[in-house]
């Protein structure tokens, strides 16, 4: 037994026929000591008296408010709640499985930039005698704040013949660092109670993952003369993190009529432009993504093909825009070549994803999972990666990236790697090895010499231990190098002389 | 399932003209776009340009401007390109191909060779 | 129009063996990069669309990868059917343009 909050308590019971229950001992919360009646709920049957009272706590009918009294005055209250457990698992009755993006997922959260807020939703077919309360932070050994509001209603559907009820709370990290990479996945919890039952709920994940933009705006149409074609543009969406030269997005125009099955044209974009071949009753639409992080698309933004938008056809908002920034010199060291370890960082980028495009959609976060992805380096707050950072003294976050990249290039090159199961010299790893050489290559400075990280000995003995290594660094590197390409882009856009 | 079946190899003078037929089946023929792309002997692939069946919009490659003209007649499913003024470099094989998306070529017709010699 | 470069224009391989054919874009195309094989006498077949989008019924030894200026195309373990002319075409703008193709013959 535990306490959920004053004078409501939480009963642990192993859920099988003629178990046992729990012994539960009650006391109520009086200096009294003499001529004191227990009753359970509205019941005026007496319980017994004392000061304590012992109960065997067995079933649903067990629980309930227990209420100690003295002559006809209440004392005191103590609401029981049980937590079934069958077979080992704790029950899941109150929420329903939304089994995206796989099984057993009962909460969901989407974060629309890097801000640190985020929502989170879930579903039930229970429409009264329902509370729910949330908890979150970052981490949970030494655990920093994040602040959620009360869990609302936010919709309601019917699916057949049940309603179903989609609830949501809104939670915001008290320090959020948006250009810094996330070692410490969020954590929530959901506390549960449906009448006299009690269930816990819990999701764990990295902003990064949960990204979610919102469409993009501002859609225009700008028809193109002695063309079939016309130019589309658009613009970031309001909610998105800036500046746009860091936090980039990347996009995707489609030209399609109502029906999915109809024939369509599609070209994917950096820029926030672009030609395609409008035709009658067709619509165009644009969605756009993380450029180095391969989260959600965000939702369509859509206008017909007939009658071409507004006559601006201006090109948006830019894609890699520096805002008013001038261009300047590195103070306090030599200036990186901005254009090509862009490039570098973003083929870097694609090839951590194809290296293992799977890795994505794994959890990987198990038992003993800290240690390994605490033994690699990660771009944190004070590193001066973000874009105030770089403008003051890029080589601080210049440093602290070629750190990371001499660290999983020794990675890759280690017995994780090279180790069975084989991969070839020439497989995404392997360029990605080569490619991680080539942009800390770039980065070094002419006879200076930054100090590197120790390589961790992480040597699994099994072939599946190894695998999973593998997939674990693998995420992780995912991970770091995108916040290098954020920092390059924005270096190539605002800082390159 | 979707085919495309082109005409027989053409042999012209040079500055004449070719009209090479690509007859689809197996699906809804306006629902697709037609392209045409054409290939030198031993040489790489050229794109021509494409047609929308639905509603008789083209698209030509610059090189092929004023010189090509796609149409497509609906009735018997047939898409045909003539291509005029013909010289000695535009012998080649000359495929047909349909996709439902507009910028790659997903079913392709066995080829017509267009043989131009004097 | 953009120019799509193609190496190496011959690779030799043994049976079994991995091949990775590259192909360049003159400027930056995003991943609108797709790959056909073709076959003497046959004509091309797409293979990847995308850079990456694999297309059922061709084998999972053929992958790609790649955005903006560089694309790769992996066979992972060369069988006899698959000595070939690959080409790779980008769908970035129009006019649509191939790369000159890459010659995959037998050790």
């Known amino acids: 037994i535990w306490e959920l909050k004053k004078d409501v308590y939480v009963v642990e019971l192993d859920w099988y026929p003629d178990a046992p229950g729990e012994m539960v001992v009650l006391t109520c919360d009086t200096p009294e000591e003499d001529g004191i009646t227990w009753t359970l709920d509205q019941s005026s049957e007496v319980l017994g008296s004392g000061k304590t009272l012992t109960i065997q706590v067995k079933e649903f009918g067990d629980a309930g408010q227990y209420t100690c009294h003295k002559g006809g005055e209440v004392l005191s209250h103590s609401l029981l709640l049980l937590h079934k457990k069958e077979d080992g698992i704790w029950s899941t009755d109150i929420l329903k499985d939304q089994k995206e993006p796989k099984n057993k997922t009962f909460l969901r959260c989407e974060a629309k930039n890097y801000s640190g807020r985020f929502t989170c939703w879930w579903l039930t077919t229970i429409s009264t005698d329902l509370t729910f309360s949330v908890k979150s932070s970052r981490g949970s050994s030494d655990p920093q704040g994040v602040t959620c509001g009360a869990a609302t209603l936010s919709a309601e559907r019917v699916r057949g013949d049940n309603k179903e009820y989609e609830y949501s709370v809104e939670c915001q990290e008290d320090s959020a660092c948006p250009a810094a990479e996330e070692s410490l996945p969020i954590e929530v919890m959901v506390d549960a109670v449906h009448k006299l039952k009690y269930e816990n709920y819990t999701s764990s994940f990295f902003i990064r993952d949960i990204i979610k933009p919102d469409p993009p705006k501002n859609l225009q149409l700008k028809p193109l003369k002695n063309s079939r074609q016309v130019e589309v543009s658009w613009e970031y969406p309001d909610t998105w993190s800036t500046p746009h030269s860091y936090f980039s997005l990347t996009f995707c125009v489609q030209v399609q009529g109502k029906s999915k099955r109809e024939k369509k044209d599609r070209v994917f974009t950096d820029k926030t432009s672009a030609t395609v071949a409008c035709r009658k009753n067709a619509s165009i639409s644009v969605r756009a993504q993380d450029r180095y992080y391969s989260s959600s698309w965000s939702e369509w933004a859509s206008v017909p093909c007939s009658g071409s938008g507004s006559s601006r056809g201006g090109s948006g908002s830019g894609g890699s825009g520096g805002g008013g920034s001038k261009l300047r010199a590195v103070p306090g060291g030599s200036s990186p070549a901005w254009t090509q370890c862009q490039q570098l960082s973003q083929k870097l980028c694609t090839l951590a994803w194809s290296a293992h495009p799977l890795v994505g959609h794994m959890d990987l976060r198990e038992e003993g999972d800290e240690e390994t992805t605490n033994d690699v380096p990660h771009i944190q707050c004070g590193d001066g990666c973000d874009p105030q950072g770089l403008r003051d003294n890029s080589q601080f976050c210049l440093q602290r990236i070629h750190q990371g990249l001499i660290f999983y290039e020794k990675l890759l090159g280690s017995d994780i790697f090279t180790g069975e199961p084989s991969l070839l010299p020439d497989s995404p790893v392997g360029q990605l090895h080569a490619s991680l050489l080539g942009l800390s290559q770039l980065l070094q400075p002419e006879g200076h010499h930054w100090e590197t990280q120790q390589i961790p000995s992480l040597s699994p003995s099994q072939p599946w231990q190894r695998l999973l290594l593998r997939f674990k660094i693998l995420r992780s590197l995912q991970a770091f190098v995108a916040v290098a390409a954020r920092v390059f882009a924005h270096g190539a856009a605002t800082l390159s002389p | 399932q979707v085919q495309l079946v082109q005409s027989g190899a053409e042999v012209k003078k040079p500055g004449a003209s070719v009209k090479v037929s690509c007859k689809a089946s197996?699906?809804?023929?306006?629902?697709?776009?037609l392209h045409w792309v054409r290939q030198a002997p031993g040489q790489g692939l050229e794109w021509m340009g494409w047609?929308?069946?639905?509603?008789?919009?083209?698209e030509y490659a610059p090189k092929f401007q004023g010189r090509v003209t796609m149409t497509t007649d609906t009735s018997t499913s047939t898409a045909y390109m003539e291509l005029r003024s013909l010289r000695s470099d535009d012998t080649a094989v000359y495929y047909c191909?349909?996709?439902?998306?507009?910028?790659?070529?997903?079913?392709w017709g066995q080829g017509t060779m267009v043989t131009v010699s004097s | 129009e953009i120019v799509m470069t193609q190496s190496p224009a011959t690779l030799s391989v043994s049976p079994g063996e991995r091949a990775t054919l590259s192909c360049r874009a003159s400027?930056?195309?995003?991943?609108?990069l797709h790959w056909y094989q073709q076959k003497p006498g046959q004509a091309p077949r797409l293979l990847i669309y995308?850079?990456?989008q694999s297309i059922s019924g061709i084998p999972a030894r053929f992958s790609g990868s790649g955005s903006g200026t560089e694309f790769t195309l992996t066979i992972s373990s060369l069988q006899s059917e698959d000595f070939a002319v690959y080409y790779c075409?980008?769908?970035?703008?129009?006019?649509?343009?191939f790369g000159g193709g890459t010659k995959v013959e037998i050790k």
């Open positions: 197996g699906y809804t023929f306006t629902d697709y776009y």
């Open positions: 400027q930056s195309i995003s991943i609108n």
């Open positions: 047609i929308d069946p639905e509603n008789g919009d083209t």
């Open positions: 995308f850079a990456s």
């Open positions: 075409q980008q769908s970035n703008s129009f006019p649509l343009t």
């Open positions: 191909n349909a996709n439902k998306e507009l910028r790659y070529f997903d079913v």
